[in-house]
Every structure is written in structure tokens, then in C-alpha cells.
């Protein structure tokens, strides 16, 4: 089921999902002078089964100026998510797939692809927060938030941070030290439900991830 | 909660013009892909095509492409059917229609009855 | 791109169940998991009642049930009820990245 809307935004904060969950859909987005190849993708989508998952749907982009005749390939859709927007910075370490049965990693980055990714968002999602770059975190409580589904409507939990103007920068849950890059982290999903267990897998993935290659923007 | 909201009922004459609307909500309508699908009267549903509002790149059915025109305005989260010259057997009921969970159409419009009639 | 086959018509009565069939090529239903089926009422528009093949979103009661075998994707309604009289459309993504719908069952509960 797809979440209505966006995860809640916090002053100077950005989010990520650790993994994406089955049902996840990324737009196939292309940049500028680009366009998607004729009978191409229109997203992919994050499909299979509990122990393997993987991203249907291949994106590809052609140059706008010239008729879409190159590399087609048949798409093979998949179910959504509720949208989310990341501005792509550099090429990422994918996290190890079999830490999370059910949920896809991020996907790599397809030839022209747009600046920034879209993906849509199910039931039972969940996205960390960490403050941005000059910013502290003051946490009141888990820094994340879980799209949940409450009398037949999606809603997102609050997540418990406030940032505040200090010249340091905070992580995510599992990390100590300041970020050394002042690039924001990317999105990711994880189970809905929420059980010690998997805030110990998502913490562990959060603080051994490298890196990342996305900044979210909101919409 | 997310719904499509279409416009009112035309009644219209064969070799005029036509556009339909299908409003969507602000926050999420740009980046979903919109489908029109026509079901004339006692008959069965027909997909017509699909744009996507974010940048209005739109598919056609072979059946429908030619006579009709799907456009998008992202400002007015808005998308639009249109014929530029409209027969009798253009009388129908337009949904538009969602992109959803595994290409499925997962929120429907209540539809825009047309008309075409000398 | 022909339309999916199903059966014109079906009837049960209250309590039993029917299974409606849509049959289409190895470029659609046969090449693809994305099968969706739709509840139409006179004068309504459609709902989504089944996707990928055998999916049910939130609200969908747990009587409908989808299936695929082959070029062939099936729904079943058990433990018929009078609300569920009303028109039934399968509809599958195909090769060509266009969508196509079936023919239409009338369900009537007899």
C-alpha cells in the first residue's frame, strides 16, 4: 500500500532508508535533453520474496534529440512507494542485501540519469534522520520515521530530533563521530515492524554505510 | 486521502473540440503516472494512454493514438484529455486513473461523461 | 492489442463461489505478474480489487482472491455476498508497455 505522502520534514535535517522495502518504485527519471526510451520503464519497482529481492525494470534514457530507436528494452513494472526525492552526488556502496530479507538495496545510478531520484513509498517503511552538515542533534528519541497504515490511512510517525546550530555534525543511530563528508546520506526502507531486532540490523547497516550519494530534497 | 478529481459532463457536437481535466493532489500528483481509460455506454473499459505530469511524457493505445491528445500542467497538478475533433462514437465515460502498486491503477476519478451528438 | 477474453457473464448464489477466468498471450498476462482486476457497480467507477496477480489492498476483503497460470489469471470470490453483484475487468501491463483490459464479467448473485 502506498504512503499518501512524504516523511515528516525536520529544520535542517535530512532522511534515508537503509533498504527499500518490497514494492518500493523509482522513477525513471532522466536529466535534461534526455528522455525515457519509447515502450521503455516507466519505474522500477522492488520485487520477490523474503529471502531474495531484487529491482525490476530497467530505466533508460535517450537523447531527446533523436527518435527513441536505442537499446529498448521491454520494462517489467512493480509496486510503488510513496515518493521520495534525492539529488544524486556520487556513486554509493549498496548495502549488503541479505541483511534484510524482503527489501531491496539502492540501485545504481542508470546512463543520463535526472539529478534527483523519486520513489514511492509503502506501508510499513522506515527512514532515518540525521541533522545536516553545522547542525547538532538533540535527540528526544529515535531519529526515524515509519509510514503506518491507521483506519485504512497512511501516515508517518514523528521522528523525535531536533537540530540545532552547532558547528558539528551529527550521525545516525550506531555512529559517533562527525561525518567527515558534508553530503547527506541515502534513503532507504526498512521492516515495518519495528522489533529490537531489526533497529539492531538497521543500526548496524547505518553505521557500517559509507558515505552515500544522496542529499533528499523535499518536494 | 488521495483522489482524482475530473470534470464536469460535456455535451458535444461531432467535428468540435474537447478538453477534460483530472485535478490531483498537490503534493504527490506531478510524480505519478496518470492513465485515461473510456467506457462507452453498457460497454467495457478501454485504455486509452498514460502521461506522466512531472514531465509529460506520455504512451499511447494504438487504438486511440492519432485522435486524441494527452497533456499535463504541473502547476495546476492537472492532467488533460483532448480531441481536437470529436465523433459520435467519442460518447463515453473518461476515467483517469492512477499508476499504482505493480502497474496496477490503484485510484480511479468518478469520470467525465462526453457526449457527441448532432 | 485485442482485448483479454473472459466469460460475459457469471452467477452464483450467496455463500458459494465463482472463479472468473481471463485469458490473454505470453505478451501479457503469460509474460507478466502484473495483473490487476477491478470491481465496477453501475454507475461507479472502478475499484482495485486484486494486483500482481494475487495482491489485495488494504480494505479488500480476504473473499477475493486472484491466481495466474500459464496465459490464463483467475479471480475467486468466496462466500459470495449480494454486494459483490457488479461488474469484474482484469487488466495486464503488456510487451508493447501499454495496458489492456478484459472484455468484463457481469456477476450476478442470484
Known amino acids: 500500500e502506498l504512503c499518501d505522502d512524504d516523511p515528516p520534514e525536520i529544520p535542517h535535517a535530512t532522511f534515508k532508508a537503509m533498504a527499500y522495502k518490497e514494492g518500493t518504485m523509482l522513477n525513471c527519471e532522466c536529466k535534461r535533453g534526455f528522455r525515457r526510451i519509447k515502450s521503455g520503464s516507466l519505474y522500477m519497482l522492488c520485487t520477490g520474496n523474503s529471502s531474495h529481492s531484487s529491482w525490476d525494470n530497467q530505466c533508460q534514457c535517450t537523447s531527446s534529440a533523436t527518435r527513441n530507436t536505442t537499446k529498448q528494452v521491454t520494462p517489467q513494472p512493480e509496486e510503488q512507494k510513496e515518493r521520495k526525492t534525492t539529488e544524486m552526488q556520487s556513486p554509493m556502496q549498496p548495502v549488503d542485501q541479505a541483511s534484510l530479507p524482503g527489501h531491496c538495496r539502492e540501485p545504481p545510478p542508470w546512463e543520463n540519469e535526472a539529478t534527483e531520484r523519486i520513489y514511492h513509498f509503502v506501508v510499513g517503511q522506515m527512514v532515518y534522520y540525521q541533522c545536516v552538515q553545522g547542525y547538532r542533534a538533540l535527540h528526544r528519541g529515535p531519529a526515524e520515521s515509519v509510514c503506518k497504515m491507521t483506519h485504512g490511512k497512511t501516515r508517518w510517525t514523528q521522528p523525535q530530533l531536533i537540530c540545532t546550530g552547532e558547528m558539528e555534525t551529527s550521525q545516525f543511530p550506531g555512529e559517533e563521530k562527525p561525518q567527515a563528508s558534508p553530503e547527506g546520506r541515502p534513503e532507504s526502507e526498512t521492516s515495518c515492524l519495528v522489533t529490537t531486532t531489526d533497529f539492531q540490523i538497521q543500526t548496524e547497516m547505518a553505521a557500517t554505510m559509507e558515505t552515500s550519494i544522496f542529499t533528499t530534497e523535499y518536494q | 486521502e488521495v483522489q482524482l478529481v475530473q470534470s464536469g459532463a460535456e455535451v458535444k457536437k461531432p467535428g468540435e473540440s474537447l478538453k477534460i481535466s483530472c485535478k490531483g493532489p498537490e503534493y504527490s500528483f506531478n510524480r505519478y503516472w496518470i492513465a485515461w481509460v473510456r467506457q462507452r455506454p453498457g460497454k467495457g473499459l478501454e485504455w486509452m494512454g498514460i502521461?506522466?505530469?512531472?514531465?509529460?511524457?506520455?504512451r499511447y493505445s494504438p487504438t486511440f493514438e492519432g485522435h486524441v491528445t494527452l497533456s499535463a500542467d504541473m502547476s495546476l497538478t492537472t492532467a488533460y484529455l483532448q480531441w481536437s475533433s470529436l465523433r459520435a462514437s467519442d460518447t463515453a465515460m473518461y476515467y483517469c486513473?492512477?499508476?499504482?502498486?505493480?502497474?496496477?491503477?490503484?485510484?480511479w476519478g468518478k469520470g467525465t461523461m462526453v457526449t457527441v451528438s448532432s | 492489442q485485442s482485448a483479454l477474453t473472459q466469460p460475459a457473464s457469471v452467477s452464483g448464489s450467496p455463500g458459494q463461489s465463482i472463479t472468473i477466468f481471463c485469458t490473454g498471450t505470453?505478451?501479457?498476462?503469460?509474460?507478466?505478474?502484473?495483473v490487476s482486476w477491478y470491481q465496477q457497480h453501475p454507475g461507479k467507477a472502478p475499484k482495485l480489487m486484486i494486483y500482481?496477480?494475487?495482491k489485495r489492498p488494504s480494505g479488500v476483503s480476504n473473499r477475493f482472491s486472484g491466481s495466474k497460470s500459464g496465459n490464463t489469471a483467475s479471480l475467486t470470490i468466496s462466500g459470495l455476498q449480494a454486494e459483490d453483484e457488479a461488474d469484474y475487468y482484469c487488466?495486464?501491463?503488456?510487451?508493447?508497455?501499454?495496458?489492456?483490459f478484459g472484455g468484463g464479467t457481469q456477476l450476478t448473485v442470484l
Open positions: 500482481d496477480v494475487s
Open positions: 486513473a492512477r499508476l499504482g502498486s505493480y502497474y496496477a491503477f490503484d485510484i
Open positions: 502521461i506522466y505530469p512531472g514531465d509529460s511524457d506520455a
Open positions: 487488466s495486464s501491463y503488456t510487451s508493447s508497455s501499454t495496458w489492456v
Open positions: 505470453s505478451s501479457d498476462v503469460g509474460g507478466y505478474n502484473y
